[in-house]
Amino acid sequence: SGTTNTVAAYNLTWKSTNFKTILEWEPKPVNQVYTVQISTKSGDWKSKCFYTTDTECDLTDEIVKDVKQTYLARVFSYPAGNVESTGSAGEPLYENSPEFTPYLETNLGQPTIQSFEQVGTKVNVTVEDERTLVRRNNTFLSLRDVFGKDLIYTLYYWKSSSSGKKTAKTNTNEFLIDVDKGENYCFSVQAVIPSRTVNRKSTDSPVECMGQEKGEFREI
């Protein structure tokens, strides 16, 4: 049989951020290669990453076709140099991945504060609307395009001289907050999808502070 020195893949894990989606698995191959297949629950299997010695496969192109679908992948193991060999049951060894629904499970990438502008005692903070690899009509959609009002941002802001973090929330990419005149503030934002139960929050954006080049100050 061609399976004597072929082992099935294990620890199949989806790694996905802002819909960039990679399936990873173990073990590192010794005298074997892998092919990955992916399908929706009701769809046909599509093969990817043919006869690879990698232990990962980028499945982004497949999942972005419909991010609200639930996907299943499987990893086939073949003896190196003899990929026609099959197991004793007439099939190569394979292992199934957990199910994966991109819209519900992709991690939210670290957001970026695009700009902030102070006018008197108001500050407008704008979050960059990150581009994803999801396409519609040949155009790449932004995170806001994909998630709509399901996506909110939490702004943490604090006086440079203090530690307590005030919060504000928006379901757009802009905040308008009240600040004390003559005080410098720092900002950090976090993306949140409240309707989720897991992967609800992104990591925090890098901190941006007033008095640095990203912002603009206008005295009225």
Epitope: Y156, G164, T167, D178, V192, P194, K201
Partner: antibody
């Protein structure tokens, strides 16, 4: 089932310290925010402070700033309220509550509360 | 800090009565107002969020509305289990603040 259980309350002398715990089950605290709210006997609700367990960010009411510290241990799925330099006016039932984190819903689940009495 | 002024502080009503409690914010809080019910010795329970949305599992006799910075909690037909204290809270800005509470008692 989402549940929050406070513990650690009791009688303490003025100037003393106490640490309250808020053990969460049915959800992971780092995905949400945890607030502490207190209620003096026969009085209304007073917000104490919050923590985002994902990053440790906190904010406190002026009445407790510098004396109280909120922390969280995500591995234990538990938030804490460390209370130092306690005063008679800190006597209250202390509740922890979960902040759902949306624009709309705020404190959707509350613990049963734990009584802190500051008296000599 | 934003003040939430709640009125009345207490009221007496009978089963079947329509009850209205109001809360006035000291500045604009958009719709970021919640209403809670608290019974003696128990934790508060969320009733209304975002000024007018009924929280899951809350009876439809409870409703909320907003007019500018004025917020209203209405119980259309008071039931025996509704005798409790009600609090409004704004969460538009940090720190979030509560109204002083309204105790609804049996007439």
């Amino acid at each position: 089932e989402v549940q929050l259980v406070e513990s650690g309350g009791g009688l303490v002398q003025p100037g003393g310290s106490l640490r309250l715990s808020c053990a969460a089950s049915g959800f992971t605290i780092h995905e949400y925010w945890i607030h502490w709210v207190r209620q003096a006997p026969g009085k209304g609700l007073e917000w104490v402070g919050y923590i985002d367990p994902a990053n440790g960010f906190t904010y406190y009411a002026d009445s407790v700033k510098g004396r109280f510290t909120i922390s969280a241990d995500t591995s234990k799925n538990t938030a804490y309220l460390q209370m130092n330099s306690l005063r008679a006016e800190d006597t209250a039932v202390y509740y922890c509550a979960r902040d759902y984190g949306s624009l709309q819903v705020f404190l959707d689940y509350w613990g049963q509360g734990t009584l802190v009495t500051v008296s000599s | 800090d934003i003040q939430m002024t709640q009125s009345p502080s207490s009221l007496s009503a009978s089963v079947g009565d329509r009850v209205t409690i109001t809360c006035r914010a000291s500045q604009d809080v958009n719709t970021a107002v919640a209403w809670y019910q608290q019974k003696p010795g128990k934790a508060p329970k969320l009733l209304i969020y975002s000024a007018s949305f009924l929280y899951s599992g809350v009876p439809s006799r409870f409703s909320g509305s907003r007019s500018g910075t004025d917020f209203t909690l209405t119980i259309s037909s008071l039931q025996p289990e509704d005798f409790a204290t009600y609090y409004c809270q704004q969460h538009y800005t940090t720190p979030p603040t509560f109204g002083q509470g309204t105790k609804v008692e049996i007439k």
